[in-house]
Amino acid sequence: EEELQVIQPDKSVSVAAGESAILHCTVTSLIPVGPIQWFRGAGPARELIYNQKEGHFPRVTTVSESTKRENMDFSISISNITPADAGTYYCVKFRKGSPDTEFKSGAGTELSVRAKPS
């Protein structure tokens, strides 16, 4: 069976301040079992943007029903975008365990923020 791929189709997304940003992510397999997390940045200091399992993410909603077992779309929407939200966002698949371990990352989507239209 082909190994799971994490696909972020948009290399970049530009959003006007105040609007919502949709960041697309799909996986090509249900195996291995484990959650998806979204991060801003790719190094040790990366910021957690969304965790499918737990956490507090008031501005983030999932585009599809990510809790459904057969779901392979892990796109998210971030509301009320400001210039401080600019950066590169990564969709990352984890393998279930104690603790969960990182399995594969998407290539990243760079979010840029345009000035609010007057």
Partner: antibody, heavy 117, light 108 residues
């Protein structure tokens, strides 16, 4: 408002241990990597350790094998367990939040650790 | 490992004058450089990042420039509260995080 408050500093002898704590408030602690940075008296800043949001840990060579960083997201608290302390570990230890692009945007006021015989 | 060298070690100036602080990296770091200010008995405060971008609440008399290996922090018209120690830091990839040795700006 973001607040970072360190505690646990004090005077110890070489070879002894100390555990520092940093209580965080005003932001979603579990979403950010956290660091310890130290400053010896009259000297510059030296990064000590980082713990990522997934609890992966990183250390400066000078403390590797002696210091252990950890976090308790349920208590919004960062820790630094310091073992086999040496005179050269004497410093003010700052807890610092780091952004995704490697900026130390918030710092505590620091806690002084003195290692002396 | 990148080394950041700051110069001069101490800068003696009067209020109203311009301060020019240098930070040189031992290898190119693009524009990934930040500056911090530290006053006696206080924690450092982020001033500038990505070489030129002022952090929130930082007055426009502080400006940064440079790229590659040579970077400059300029403080136009020094105010009494600007006398402090300034550190540069590379924002480049992984730990260890590296700080320069600092430049003290003191009153002449």
């Amino acid at each position: 408002d973001v607040q970072l408050v360190e505690s646990g500093g004090g005077v110890v002898r070489p070879g002894e241990s100390l555990r520092l704590s940093c209580a965080a408030s005003g932001f979603t602690f579990s979403n950010f990597a956290m660091n310890w940075v130290r400053q010896a008296p009259g000297e510059g800043l030296e990064w000590v350790s980082l713990i990522s949001v997934t609890a992966t840990t990183y250390y400066a060579d000078s403390v590797k094998g002696r210091f252990t960083i950890s976090r308790d997201n349920s208590k919004n608290t960062l820790y630094l367990q310091m073992n086999s302390l040496r005179a050269e570990d004497t410093a003010v230890y700052y807890c610092a939040k780091v952004t995704w692009n490697n900026l130390f945007d918030y710092w505590g006021l620091g806690t002084l650790v003195t290692v002396s015989s | 490992e990148i080394v950041l060298t700051q110069s001069p070690g101490t800068l003696s100036l009067s209020p109203g004058e311009r301060a020019t602080l240098s930070c040189r990296a031992s290898q190119p770091i693009d524009s990934y450089l930040a500056w911090y200010q530290q006053k006696p008995g206080q924690a450092p405060r982020l001033l500038i990042y990505n070489t030129v971008t002022r952090a929130t609440g930082i007055p426009d008399r502080f400006s940064g420039s440079g790229s590659g290996t040579d970077f400059t922090l300029t403080i136009n018209r020094l105010e009494p509260e600007d006398f402090a120690v300034y550190y540069c830091q590379h924002q480049y990839d992984w730990p260890p995080y590296i700080f320069g040795g600092g430049t003290k700006v003191e009153i002449k």
